[in-house]
């Protein structure tokens, strides 16, 4: 398991159920870097933190998956968690 994947999982597992739901909704409309597609809505909404981590990494690979996760956390006002995720990724 990669360091970035672990960091993404750790962040998502620290969200409340309500925050995880909000994370998924924001992920559906977050601005994406050129060349990346969006995870289909139907697949996304039923996922738990572990499934969502796997989907983020398979869709976006570890580096961009971690960056994207951090940005969605920032959009949710969770800047500290986003910073911790990025720090763990860059260790």
């Amino acid at each position: 398991m990669g360091r970035a994947r672990d960091a993404i999982l750790d962040a998502l597992e620290n969200l409340t159920a309500e925050e995880l739901k909000k994370f998924k909704l924001k992920l559906l409309s977050v601005p994406l870097a050129a060349g990346y597609g969006r995870i289909p809505r139907g697949a996304l909404l039923s996922m738990d933190a572990l499934d969502l981590t796997d989907k983020l990494v398979s869709f976006y690979l570890e580096t961009y998956g971690a960056e994207l996760t951090a940005n969605v956390l920032r959009d949710m006002g969770l800047q500290e968690m986003a910073g911790q995720l990025q720090a763990a990724t860059h260790q």
Epitope: P31, R74, M76, G77
Partner: antibody
Framework: QVQLQQPGTELVKPGASVKLSCRAS?????????????LEWIGNINLSNGRTNYN??FRAMATLTVDKSSSTAYTQLSSLTSEDSAVYYC?????????????WGQGTSVTVSS | NIVMTQYPKSMSLSIGERVTLRCKAS??????VSWYQQKPEQSPKLLIY???NRYTGVPDRFTGSGSATDFILTITSVQAEDLADYHC?????????FGAGTKLELK
């Protein structure tokens, strides 16, 4: 257009406390502006779960709380000095991405004077 | 803390002029920069968020650009109602921070 409701003015004595209120929703920020100066972020509170973040500069003097039943955010400012005379704004972050402050209250002018 | 430096501090200009306001972050803040307009005795109002997204109802003469550490607010043809203070702010990291502001005045 969402309107954030704040009382207009507060006059308090040095060393005293004041509790400012703001009818709001979502993430509510508190921002200080001294006359003729820039904006300083005090902290924010999430009205749905009570999660708070503070600017360390204000942590000792500001306490952010929420009353969910009335959708009201509060900041209690304690041990006030003349340096705390300022307009205090509440602002919301409602835009889905990038967390800007898109709705602002009209501000409460706090004057600290004996 | 991330320091946001705005320049110039003030500008005197004529109606119809093109204006460029600059904001520099002390470290990379991605696109997490907003621009606010504040008129005397009024609350700030959001103009631009995410460095380049115009907020609802903001005239298209206001344009934001930049990323990472260097950001620009351009007003293509200044109107009398644009004379105000302009603040940039970052929402990338806590504490959220603002620049000291740029004041636009009539020449």
């Amino acid at each position: 257009q969402v309107q954030l409701q704040q009382p207009g003015t507060e006059l308090v004595k040095p060393g005293a406390s004041v509790k400012l209120s703001c009818r709001a929703s979502g993430w509510t920020h508190w921002v200080k502006q001294r006359p003729g100066q820039g904006l300083e972020w005090i902290g924010n509170i999430n009205l749905s779960n009570g999660r708070t973040n503070y600017n360390e500069k204000f942590r000792a003097m500001a306490t952010l709380t929420v009353d969910k039943s009335s959708s009201t955010a509060y900041t209690q400012l304690s041990s006030l000095t003349s340096e705390d005379s300022a307009v205090y704004y509440c602002a919301n972050s409602m835009v889905p991405h990038f967390f800007p402050m898109d709705y602002w209250g009209q501000g409460t002018s706090v004057t600290v004077s004996s | 803390n991330i320091v946001m430096t705005q320049y110039p501090k003030s500008m005197s200009l004529s109606i119809g002029e093109r204006v460029t306001l600059r904001c520099k972050a002390s470290e990379n803040v991605g696109s997490y920069v907003s621009w606010y307009q504040q008129k005397p005795e009024q609350s700030p109002k959001l103009l631009i968020y995410g460095a380049s997204n115009r907020y609802t109802g903001v005239p298209d003469r206001f344009t934001g650009s930049g990323s990472a550490t260097d950001f620009i607010l351009t007003i293509t043809s200044v109107q009398a109602e644009d004379l105000a203070d302009y603040h940039c702010g970052q929402s990338y990291n806590y504490p959220l921070t603002f620049g000291a502001g740029t004041k636009l005045e009539l020449k």
